[in-house]
Each structure stands twice: as structure tokens, then as C-alpha cells.
């Protein structure tokens, strides 16, 4: 019946409605059905929310920052039904609500809780800074605070630095990782603990390839089973890291199952793609080839980031021409 | 059951100011809209006042409206009319009356009344 | 704000007869109409609410009716406890105007 919103039931007549920032939500409220309904729902037993009595809407007296943003289930209030639906919720709207609602055989008032949460999609980033290599977890707008929880190899790390900024509305928090000189496999959890909702980035890096000038080298690139679920939505993103910034080579998406090639001599396999295998063919290698190749898998649950080092060297005859 | 006790009645000098109070027992008093009504003894009935179940809207009649203040205070079960500048026609009885719900519907119940008489 | 007027002001009728009064509003109300009665030094009991629905335990021979503008409360056949003065009241929005009252009694 309530699709927008989850409810976590506690007593005293008390429910917990929990919405996500900007999105509709509803909150519930039910009576004994009787003739002439009155329903008053308010803000902090102070805020007036939505007013309707006599058949009708009265809302001359809704705070300002309700309008434009309530409505009753107006066909279903004959069957008890005098629950709120409320559009784009924002932080500002968290707290009590009361819903009384009277008719000519009884008065009864209900409590709803709103707690509103934020989780934009977190992302994993590598990058270089002069001659050190970071990861980053960052989330742009989160609320409440999350957890972030970093391991190397599967082992919790403790060092867990968080840059936050907080604004009106959420924090943004970045947290960054050194792992210069680094082979290990990186992860790095962030949990929304009112959402119930965690994302998690995934780090490895493959050992080094030697190729020579004009061969082709393979680059593996497959979902840890794990977090990956193929019903999901994902992008997959090959690119090559060239004096400190990646150029996309090409990039695959799972919703229209489109790949998008930007450079020639990539290619992909159509059939591992269908067996989720993103590996990739790079044709005809030349000396400036040489680099880093990030594989980035990424969904709304997840990032996971597959790094390869590519060094091509002079072939024979290129050598014995200089 | 509902029971509604008004007092705070009596004679007063034009000009001057009384406050009635009405005692709520028998039901949810916080729930429910209060009006205060009253009648000329002999004549009819005349709306005075009403005010909702938490207070937050308050309607008068234009007879009385700025001289006259309805209020409640939930945590007492207590109804007031605080009647300023009186005049010889607010000689009245002064019913407190219950609401059907929060205070814009009809009346469901009457106290007995109390007589507020003004005279020089 | 809307005017109550209310036809007879009095009446006197005999045990049995059927009773007519009438209650009119300057402006259209819907069914928000409540009429009271009032007994001899006694205070006003709600007798019909939404302009037709009876408040529970009033005898069955009042009855009520109308919409809009016009409405009428009926005692269908007069007993000598229905002496009294009978209200309309109007409760679509403030202030809830009573009409003047229609006084009853016993030939």
C-alpha cells in the first residue's frame, strides 16, 4: 500500500517513516471509518501540514513550506485511509508529525516520525599526486554521517582519514588512501546506517605487462561474483592514465547494452561481455602505450576499479633502425 | 460522560473586564473544539466564540470580536472567555459548549450556563 | 457573513398535529445545518446534525431536511414534552450563526 517509504512500527501509537532526500514518501495514518471526517496533520504539534474537513481541503493556514507539497488519498478516506502523501522531502522536513483525525464517532491522533536520509552515489578514484598514488572514497551528499571503513587485503586498516564538509542539507566526505608502492587489493565500505543501504569500492591491481612494440596485449577485467549482480545496472569504463589523467578509451552500458569506443584499436569481446567479462584487446601497441589501464565497474552498490601496467618496449627492429 | 461547569459569572460595571472558565470532564478535552454560546435570558441563543482543539484558530463574533478572548489550556481541561471592555448588552447567560470534533462543526453538548450581568 | 431566519417565530399546534418549521441562510450552507431545542429553563440538546441525520436517542418523529438555502425540521406528530423553542444553527464555516428560534406549544 505505501510503496515510498519504509515504516519501522514502535508503540504508543508511534511510527518511523524513513524518505530519501528529494524523493516522495507517504505517512501512514488510519482510522475507524465514520461520517463527517476531520483530519489535521501537523508539523511539531506546532506547523499546520494539511487541513480537510467537510468534504475538502482547507488549507488558508498551511506553513508556507508545506504548499504545493501534500495531499490526502482523497477516494480512500471514506475506508479510513488518512494517510499523507508528501512530495520531495527534504532535511529540513525530519521530525514529529501528528495526525488527528475526528469523526462524528470518535477522535483518535497518530505520531509519525520522519527521518530523512541522503546517499548520492559514492565513487572510487585513483589518482597520482606527484609521485604518489592515492585511492579516495568520496560521497558528495550523505546524511546521516556513514561509516567508512577501509581494508587492504582483507584486513581492516585503522588509518582512515575523512575530509567532511557539511552544508545545510548533508556532508560531503572524501577519504583518501595511500597505497604508493602498493600490490594489494584495496576496499573501501561506506554504510548509510538509517538508509540500510552500503556501497562498496574494490581495488586491485594486476602485475605488470611487458609487451613489445606493434604486439597486442590482453587486459583482464571480470566482477568480483561478490558485489556483482548482473540484473543491476552498471557502467563499465575502460581508460589509460597519461601524464596524471585518464582519457577514456571506451565504456559499456549494461541498461541499453551499448559500447562506445573512442579509440581504434580497442576492442571488446561481444560474447565475454554477455558472460560479464570486460576484458579488453589493445591492437598494434606503440612506445606511447605504455601506462596504466583502470577498469572501472561501477553500479550504485559499487565501484570496482581493476588497475594494469603496461610497459612497451622498442621492438628488435625498431632498436637496430635507431 | 461529558460534563461541562462554567463559572466566573456575576455583575460588573460597564467598562470593566471578567474572565469565565469552564471545567471539562468526561472526555478527551484535548481533542475536541470548545465554543462559548450565549442567551439573554428570555431571548435566543448567539454564537460567541470558538476555538479549535489545539488553539491554533480562534473565531469570534463580530459583536464581540476585539473585545473578547477565547483560550484554553489542555493540561488544566480548562476552557476561558476573557471579556474585556463589557457593555450592558453582553448581559447574558454564557454556555460552554463541546465541539463534535476540532471546532467547526456544531455543538454536542452544553454546560448548565453561567449569568454574567452588567449594569452601572 | 450569512444571515439565519427562521419561520414562525412561534406556534401553537395540538397533540398529534405535524409540525413545520422553517430555516432559511442569506447564502448557501450545503447540509450544515444543526437544530437545537431548548425546554423551559433547561439548556439547548442537539437534536439533528448535517441538516437530516437524527443525534442518537431522539425520538424517530423528528426528522429534518433541505440543502443550500431552505430547510425544514419536521415533528411528525406533537408531544407535549416537544414544548419548547427549536434553533437552527449553521456550522459551514465562522461565525456559526443560530436563527432567532421557533417557539412551540399546546394549543
Known amino acids: 500500500i505505501f510503496p515510498l517509504a519504509f515504516f519501522i512500527y514502535v508503540p504508543m501509537n508511534e511510527q518511523i517513516v524513513i524518505g530519501r532526500l528529494d524523493e516522495d514518501i507517504i505517512l501512514p495514518s488510519s482510522f475507524e471509518r465514520g461520517s463527517e471526517v476531520v483530519i489535521h496533520w501537523k508539523y511539531q504539534d506546532s506547523y499546520k501540514v494539511h487541513s480537510y474537513y467537510k468534504g475538502s481541503d482547507h488549507l488558508e493556514s498551511q506553513d508556507p513550506r508545506y504548499a504545493n507539497r501534500t495531499s490526502l488519498f482523497y477516494n480512500e478516506i471514506q475506508n479510513g485511509n488518512a494517510s499523507l502523501f508528501f512530495r520531495r522531502v527534504s532535511l529540513l522536513d525530519e521530525g514529529i508529525y501528528t495526525c488527528y483525525v475526528g469523526t462524528a464517532i470518535q477522535v483518535i491522533t497518530n505520531k509519525v516520525v520522519l527521518k530523512v536520509g541522503v546517499f548520492l552515489t559514492p565513487v572510487m578514484k585513483y589518482e597520482k599526486r606527484n609521485t604518489n598514488s592515492f585511492l579516495i572514497c568520496s560521497v558528495l551528499s550523505v546524511y546521516p554521517r556513514p561509516i567508512i571503513t577501509w581494508k587492504m587485503d582483507n584486513t581492516p586498516i585503522s588509518e582512515n582519514n575523512m575530509e567532511e564538509t557539511g552544508s545545510l542539507d548533508s556532508f560531503s566526505i572524501n577519504s583518501p588512501l595511500n597505497i604508493t608502492g602498493s600490490n594489494s587489493s584495496y576496499e573501501c565500505t561506506i554504510e548509510n546506517s538509517l538508509l540500510k543501504q552500503t556501497w562498496t569500492g574494490r581495488w586491485t591491481m594486476k602485475d605488470g605487462l611487458h609487451k613489445m612494440q606493434s604486439e597486442h596485449v590482453s587486459l583482464s577485467c571480470q566482477p568480483v561474483n561478490d558485489y556483482f549482480s548482473p540484473n543491476q545496472d552498471f557502467k563499465v569504463t575502460w581508460s589509460r592514465m597519461k601524464s596524471g589523467t585518464f582519457s577514456v578509451l571506451a565504456y559499456y552500458l549494461s541498461s541499453s547494452q551499448n559500447t562506445i569506443i573512442n579509440e581504434s584499436r580497442f576492442s571488446w569481446n561481444k560474447e565475454l561481455i554477455n558472460q560479464s567479462d570486460f576484458s579488453m584487446n589493445l591492437m598494434d601497441l606503440n612506445l606511447s602505450d605504455s601506462g596504466e589501464y583502470l577498469c572501472n565497474i561501477s553500479s550504485d552498490e559499487y565501484t570496482l576499479l581493476t588497475i594494469h601496467t603496461v610497459h612497451v618496449e622498442p621492438s628488435q627492429e625498431t632498436a637496430s633502425h635507431n | 460522560q461529558v460534563q461541562l461547569v462554567e463559572s466566573g459569572g456575576g455583575v460588573v460595571q460597564p467598562g470593566r473586564s471578567l474572565r469565565l472558565s469552564c471545567a471539562a470532564s468526561?472526555?478527551?478535552?484535548?481533542?475536541?473544539?470548545m465554543h462559548w454560546v450565549r442567551q439573554v435570558p428570555g431571548k435566543g441563543l448567539e454564537w460567541v466564540a470558538v476555538?479549535?482543539?489545539?488553539?491554533?484558530?480562534?473565531d469570534y463574533a463580530d459583536s464581540v470580536k476585539g473585545r473578547f478572548t477565547i483560550s484554553r489550556d489542555n493540561s488544566k481541561n480548562t476552557l476561558y472567555l476573557q471579556m474585556n471592555s463589557l457593555r450592558v448588552e453582553d448581559t447574558a447567560v454564557y454556555y460552554c459548549?463541546?465541539?463534535?470534533?476540532?471546532?467547526?462543526?456544531?455543538?454536542?453538548?452544553w454546560g448548565q450556563g453561567t449569568l454574567v450581568t452588567v449594569s452601572s | 457573513d450569512i444571515q439565519m431566519t427562521q419561520s414562525p417565530s412561534s406556534l401553537s399546534a395540538s397533540v398529534g398535529d405535524r409540525v413545520t418549521i422553517t430555516c432559511r441562510a442569506s447564502?448557501?450552507?450545503?447540509?450544515?445545518l444543526a437544530w437545537y431545542q431548548q425546554k423551559p429553563g433547561k439548556v439547548p440538546k442537539l437534536l439533528i446534525y448535517?441538516?437530516?441525520t437524527l443525534q442518537s436517542g431522539v425520538p424517530s418523529r423528528f426528522s429534518g431536511s433541505g440543502s443550500g438555502t431552505d430547510f425544514t425540521l419536521t415533528i411528525s406528530s406533537l408531544q407535549p414534552e416537544d414544548v419548547a423553542t427549536y434553533y437552527c444553527?449553521?456550522?459551514?464555516?465562522?461565525?456559526?450563526?443560530f436563527g432567532p428560534g421557533t417557539k412551540v406549544d399546546i394549543k
Open positions: 444553527q449553521k456550522y459551514q464555516s465562522a461565525p456559526f450563526t
Open positions: 448535517a441538516a437530516s
Open positions: 476555538i479549535w482543539y489545539d488553539a491554533s484558530e480562534k
Open positions: 447564502q448557501g450552507i450545503s447540509n450544515y
Open positions: 468526561g472526555f478527551t478535552f484535548s481533542n475536541y473544539g
Open positions: 459548549a463541546k465541539d463534535l470534533i476540532s471546532g467547526i462543526y456544531y455543538v454536542d453538548h
